[in-house]
Interface confidence: medium
């Protein structure tokens, strides 16, 4: 004969676990039903009655099968360093992404917990490694024959233009100036830009100061895996 299907609540066999979408209630000592995503436990189970579930209220959610007494509050509105990419529903939290020019400074499995502005490389320094979703820009000094005259989180060092006759030699922060109006060879005009990262986050936070320029405050300051790169600057 096939085994009888137990209906919740039921006492599990010694050494066995409750089935999928059930949990063991230590007070009742019974296997009881979990509540579905979008719901929460309004009344916990007893030895004779199963869990009573209720829908999450506005601005609250549960994403998983659960037996929590209250739904989780959706995150605060996305702050000035974010854009909303997913609205709050009964089954999912609001999701915000770090806006262009920012990266996720502290991430967890649920998404980003803290956005921070991308480091800007000052004149004489260019971007050695662009920012990503979870890492800051790395700056490097412009090598001989190259320059950067901008304060930017995207500009790389560019070669000096080649002059027939040099009026002012170039340096790390300035292009060469030619005496003739038409140099022998020059790079395309305008700075070279690198793409900005976009990172997912589900947490409202305030902008955090850059490690290299932040004044002393009562809050924690972000410390990256390595010290701030030389040549970085604030806004």
């Amino acid at each position: 004969l096939p085994a009888q299907v137990a209906f919740t609540p039921y006492a599990p066999e010694p050494g066995s676990t409750c089935r999928l979408r059930e949990y063991y209630d230590q007070t009742a000592q019974m296997c009881c039903s979990k509540c579905s995503p979008g719901q929460h436990a309004k009344v916990f189970c007893t030895k004779t009655s199963d869990t009573v579930c209720d829908s999450c209220e506005d601005s609250t959610y549960t994403q998983l099968w659960n037996w929590v007494p209250e739904c989780l509050s959706c995150g605060s509105r996305c702050s000035s360093d974010q854009v909303e990419t997913q609205a709050c529903t009964r089954e999912q939290n609001r999701i915000c992404t770090c806006r262009p020019g920012w990266y996720c400074a502290l991430s967890k499995q649920e998404g980003c917990r803290l956005c921070a502005p991308l480091r800007k490389c000052r004149p004489g320094f260019g971007v050695a490694r662009p920012g990503t979703e979870t890492s800051d820009v790395v700056c490097k000094p412009c090598a001989p024959g190259t320059f950067s005259n901008t304060t930017s989180s995207t500009d790389i060092c560019r070669p000096h233009q080649i002059c027939n006759v040099v009026a002012i030699p170039g340096n790390a922060s300035m292009d060469a100036v030619c005496t003739s109006t038409s140099p022998t060879r020059s790079m395309a005009p305008g700075a070279v830009h690198l793409p900005q990262p976009v990172s997912t986050r589900s947490q409202h936070t305030q902008p955090t100061p850059e490690p290299s320029t932040a004044p002393s405050t009562s809050f924690l300051l972000p410390m990256g895996p390595s010290p701030p790169a030389e040549g970085s600057t604030g806004d």
């Epitope: 959706c74 499995q109 803290l114 890492s135």
Partner: antibody, heavy 117, light 110 residues
């Protein structure tokens, strides 16, 4: 899933010490990890956190005194210049986000550091 | 930094009684508060997160609540196994990531 600390020992003041937290059953690229310490007979004191992206944050008092780093399966806590006040059991714990909320849901047994001359 | 003030530091309650532990945050932490239980020689164990949500496998005799910046853990029908030290922990996310623990409450079961 488990977390285990190692490296705790008796050191003299000023001698740098590195504690190692070895994790198994989950990926450090998905989870943040925190370090917490507890002096004998005292309460819990948060030291800092390393996020799944590798970024670190420290308690104000711990900044400059501790450095947190990681490999693919371990998280290290370096005590740069221990003093006798750093004598404590050091715990490594997984720092999870429940939506907008945070908690330390998986702890190691701790490793004892004794600083004495 | 945010400071968590936990009271009382010690409480004694007979089996079957009710224990109430309070934590007050010095700043608005928006329910980002967890509760832990620690027994001698053991690491802390997560009991509750988001002020009122039970962690997996934790008895529903425990209840968390919030009133403004005051947070309360209530243990009803106290059992001998509840004898331990309880800590609250908040996470404050502003211009950085700050975690603070309360001083702890020792629960003695008579």
């Amino acid at each position: 899933q488990s977390v285990e600390e190692s490296g705790g020992r008796l050191v003299t003041p000023g001698t740098p010490l590195t504690l190692t937290c070895t994790v198994s059953g989950f990926s450090l690229s998905s989870y943040a990890m925190g370090w917490v310490r507890q002096a004998p007979g005292k309460g819990l004191e948060w030291i800092g956190i390393i996020g799944s992206g590798g970024n670190t944050y420290y308690a104000t008092w711990a900044k400059g005194r501790f450095t947190i780093s990681r490999t693919s399966t371990t998280v290290d806590l370096r005590i740069t210049s221990p003093t006798t006040e750093d004598t404590a059991t050091y715990f490594c714990a997984r720092d999870v986000g429940y939506g907008d909320y945070d908690a330390l849901d998986l702890w190691g047994q701790g490793t004892l550091v004794t600083v004495s001359s | 930094d945010v400071v968590m003030t936990q009271t009382p530091s010690s409480v004694s309650e007979p089996v079957g009684g009710t224990v109430t532990i309070k934590c007050q945050a010095s700043e608005e932490i928006s329910s980002n508060l967890a509760w832990y239980q620690q027994k001698p020689g053991q690491p802390p164990k997560l009991l509750m997160y988001a002020a009122s949500n039970l962690a997996s496998g934790v008895s529903s005799r425990l209840k968390g609540s919030r009133s403004g910046t005051d947070y309360t853990l209530t243990i009803s029908g106290v059992q001998c196994d509840d004898a331990a030290t309880y800590f609250c922990q908040c996470t404050y996310i502003g211009s950085g990531y700050v975690v603070a623990f309360g001083g702890g409450t020792e629960v003695v079961v008579k």
